[in-house]
């Protein structure tokens, strides 16, 4: 039975040209995390973090994506095209797969705030 929940940074905004941290946290389960996948709105993979073999950043994003902190992901040099949904997928044993959603809005405005509160989607 899947008892865990994914907490995410929820809806966040950040300034064009700046950076943002995408963060998910799996709680309320003793399941072992074997891999975490980070996907973009079109379901293309940005990066994976395999529990044994570490981080693998998709080549197309190598210059703009930094691993961490933790199992999170840092997006850098943001463009307006980065606006949209991001998904973290936790592959766990023996529970199975957990999925979290984050919505990122990239703003032209210099007053864009990056809200870092955790939400349960």
């Amino acid at each position: 039975m899947m008892t865990g929940t994914i907490e995410t940074t929820g809806n966040i905004s950040a300034k064009k040209g700046g950076s943002v941290i995408l963060q998910c946290h799996l709680s309320s389960t003793m399941a072992q995390v074997t891999q975490v996948n980070w996907e973009q709105h079109d379901h293309s993979l940005l990066a994976i973090r395999n529990a044994e073999l570490g981080w693998h950043i998709y080549p197309a994003f190598k210059d703009r994506v930094a691993p961490g902190p933790g199992l999170g992901l840092t997006l850098q040099s943001l463009t307006m095209n980065d606006t949209g949904e991001y998904f973290c997928t936790y592959h766990t044993y023996p529970d199975g797969t957990y999925r979290g959603r984050i919505f990122l809005e990239v703003l032209e405005s210099s007053v864009a705030e990056h809200s870092a509160r955790f939400q349960i989607p």
Epitope: Q32, T34, L45, L53, G54, H56, Y58, Y93, P94, G96
Partner: antibody, heavy 125, light 106 residues
């Protein structure tokens, strides 16, 4: 076609080291992990560990920790497995195998879809 | 480490027979289970991955089922080329194989 080609048979004395190579072709080497599996004569299969061809990170089976080193050379799409302090019970066929799931499929399958032909390593005094 | 127990260790069957091989994990492994066929002097060949997915190019007479701790490989109608040894393998770290099942000609 997609294949893994291993180096030839080796005969070693106890206490020596052996290094087996595994050359990949027909696919993007750095998109997959390579596992090493061995099989003693007449016995079953034993997973030895694996290496990411993307970042070189490794994970070894507990019983071989300290004696085994896995490496890759991305310029030649070749994986290597070195086993040190050889004993007679290391006599086996050593296989390299590609993990079925590419890092970019996002799957966590842990299955081996492409295998090398095997390298017989004999440890005898 | 998770132990994988295969049964039977060997069996005799005839061409056309339905053959079932079972694999039991010492604890739940969800669907992290794969099946291989190995012929003498050859490398293993992947048949089934993720408990029930047929690997590309493998005949449809092979099928896999199960989840949790109990898994089954079924050959619906045994063919002459199917006489071989079959191994299950779980992929929860660290990966381990079952002891094998030798399918012989009756």
């Amino acid at each position: 076609q997609v294949q893994l080609v291993q180096s030839g048979a080796e005969v070693k004395k106890p206490g020596a080291s052996v290094k087996v190579s595994c050359k990949a072709s027909g696919y993007t080497f750095t998109s997959y992990a390579i596992s090493w599996v061995r099989q003693a004569p007449g016995q079953g299969l034993e997973w030895m560990g694996w290496i990411s061809a993307y970042n070189g990170n490794t994970k070894y089976a507990q019983k071989l920790q300290g004696r085994v080193t896995m490496t890759t050379d991305t310029s030649t799409s070749t994986a290597y497995m070195e086993l040190r302090s050889l004993r007679s019970d290391d006599t086996a066929v050593y296989y390299c195998a590609r993990d079925l799931s590419s890092f970019w499929s996002g799957d966590v399958l842990g299955a081996f879809d492409i295998w090398g032909q095997g390298t017989m390593v004999t440890v005898s005094s | 480490d998770i132990q994988m127990t295969q049964s039977p260790s060997s069996l005799s069957a005839s061409v056309g027979d339905r053959v079932t091989i079972t694999c039991r994990a010492s604890q739940s492994i969800s669907s992290y289970l794969n099946w291989y066929q190995q012929k003498p002097g050859k490398a293993p060949k992947l048949l089934i991955y993720a408990a029930s997915s047929l690997q590309s190019g493998v005949p449809s007479r092979f099928s896999g089922s199960g989840s949790g701790t109990d898994f089954t490989l079924t050959i619906s109608s045994l063919q002459p080329e199917d006489f071989a040894t079959y191994y299950c393998q779980q992929s929860v770290p660290p990966r381990t194989f079952g002891g094998g099942t030798k399918v012989e000609i009756k």
